[in-house]
Interface confidence: medium
């Protein structure tokens, strides 16, 4: 499977909420011995590989924001910790996987990465990630609502797998 990023750029005004989205593509094994670990983190555009470095989102690490569920299940974070930081990640039955950030500030601008790890038999792992940019703007040039820019078909599926 691969991860697609439907939107590569989100431009939002300060104080707005935004939901960043990734989508699982391709066959997803729903066997009882297959589970998915999904999470989010901030990163930088490395020269070698985007999303290599894992930085916290609002002081929460990728471990704090994870979802872990079977292939056929939906899930969302109920962590008080995440919600206290204005964050919530969620996953539905259709392969969509998102993080919602509330009350955006300029400090939230940057590169965001979704990570999906498919775990088979509790030890074999297949890892994929997707990247998108969030720009939070203030002042007269800021949009009144979030504006999203679709990824090109090439960009949305050029996600590394390991």
């Amino acid at each position: 499977f691969k991860v697609a990023t439907p939107y590569s750029l989100y431009v939002c005004p300060e104080g707005q909420n935004v939901t960043l989205t990734c989508r699982l593509l391709g066959p997803v094994d729903k066997g009882h011995d297959v589970t998915f670990y999904k999470t989010w983190y901030r990163s930088s555009r490395g020269e070698v590989q985007t999303c290599s470095e894992r930085r916290p989102i609002r002081n929460l690490t990728f471990q704090d924001l994870h979802l872990h569920h079977g292939g056929h299940q939906a899930a969302n974070t109920s962590h008080d910790l995440a919600q206290r930081h204005g964050l919530e990640s969620a996953s539905d039955h259709h392969g969509n996987f998102s993080i919602t950030m509330r009350n955006l500030t300029l400090l939230d601008s940057g590169l965001y990465c979704c990570l999906v790890v498919e775990i088979r038999h509790h030890h074999s792992e297949h890892r994929v990630h997707g990247a998108m940019e969030l720009q939070v703007q203030t002042g007269k040039d800021a949009p009144s609502n979030c504006v999203v820019y679709p990824s090109s078909s090439q960009d949305s599926e050029n996600i590394t797998a390991a």
Partner: antibody, heavy 118, light 106 residues
């Protein structure tokens, strides 16, 4: 803060079994795998196996298959490793360590010394 | 099973020196991880995903490599860096460690 606290040192006779505990705190126990690694005196690190508290799934290095048993008690956030049919070469420090999927073992217990001697 | 071979086994050096150690895998791995261990202590994660510093690790440590050949570099040795360093792979079951490289004071 994240902590993994292991049970105390053990002295066992050859052929006996030992069960070591590892109590986790400061993080969501079911969001990680709990790994067990051992280190014989003056030697390197050797991975024994892992357990997923999320669903109880286990994996073992072939060397330990059938002799090591990994279990968890999610109600107390405690992982256990039992090693049976002990022999002198099992004398080692045994560590538990947490690992997030797609990551590394970022927190380790303090280690439990198991001495096997007649 | 993927065998990880570290070299050299031991390095004698002085504080301030630059040091490079290698980890060679018997078949290709996606990522390499590095741990530091001091006598009487549990291992400590240094590098994840080949080249990224774990939380709290000084910038004098760096990792690189791909495929079967990986490297850990310390740009300028500090007294607290004298320890044993292990590489480890999660790419293939069973998960294996290298035998370690010991850095000792000259």
């Amino acid at each position: 803060q994240v902590q993994l606290v292991q049970s105390g040192a053990e002295v066992k006779k050859p052929g006996a079994s030992v069960k070591i505990s590892c109590k986790a705190s400061g993080f969501s126990f079911t969001g990680y795998t709990m790994n067990w690694v051992r280190q014989a005196p003056g030697q390197g690190l050797e991975w024994i196996g892992l357990i997923s508290p999320y669903n109880g799934g286990t994996s073992y290095a072939q060397k330990f298959q059938g002799r090591a048993t990994l279990t968890v008690d999610t109600s107390t956030s405690t992982a256990y490793m039992e090693l049976s049919s002990l022999r002198s070469e099992d004398t080692a420090v045994y560590y538990c360590a947490r690992r997030a999927y797609g990551y590394a073992m970022d927190y380790w217990g303090q280690g439990t010394l198991v001495t096997v001697s007649s | 099973e993927i065998v990880l071979t570290q070299s050299p086994a031991t390095l004698s050096l002085s504080p301030g020196e630059r040091v490079t150690m290698s980890c060679s895998a018997s078949s290709s791995v996606s990522y390499m991880y590095w741990y530091q261990q001091k006598p009487g202590q549990a291992p400590r994660l240094l590098i994840y995903d080949t080249s990224n510093l774990a939380s709290g690790v000084p910038a004098r440590f760096s990792g690189s490599g791909s495929g079967t050949d990986y490297t850990l570099t310390i740009s300028s040795m500090e007294p607290e860096d004298f320890a044993v360093y292990y590489c480890q792979q999660w790419s293939s079951y069973p998960f294996t460690f290298g035998q370690g490289t010991k850095l000792e004071i000259k």
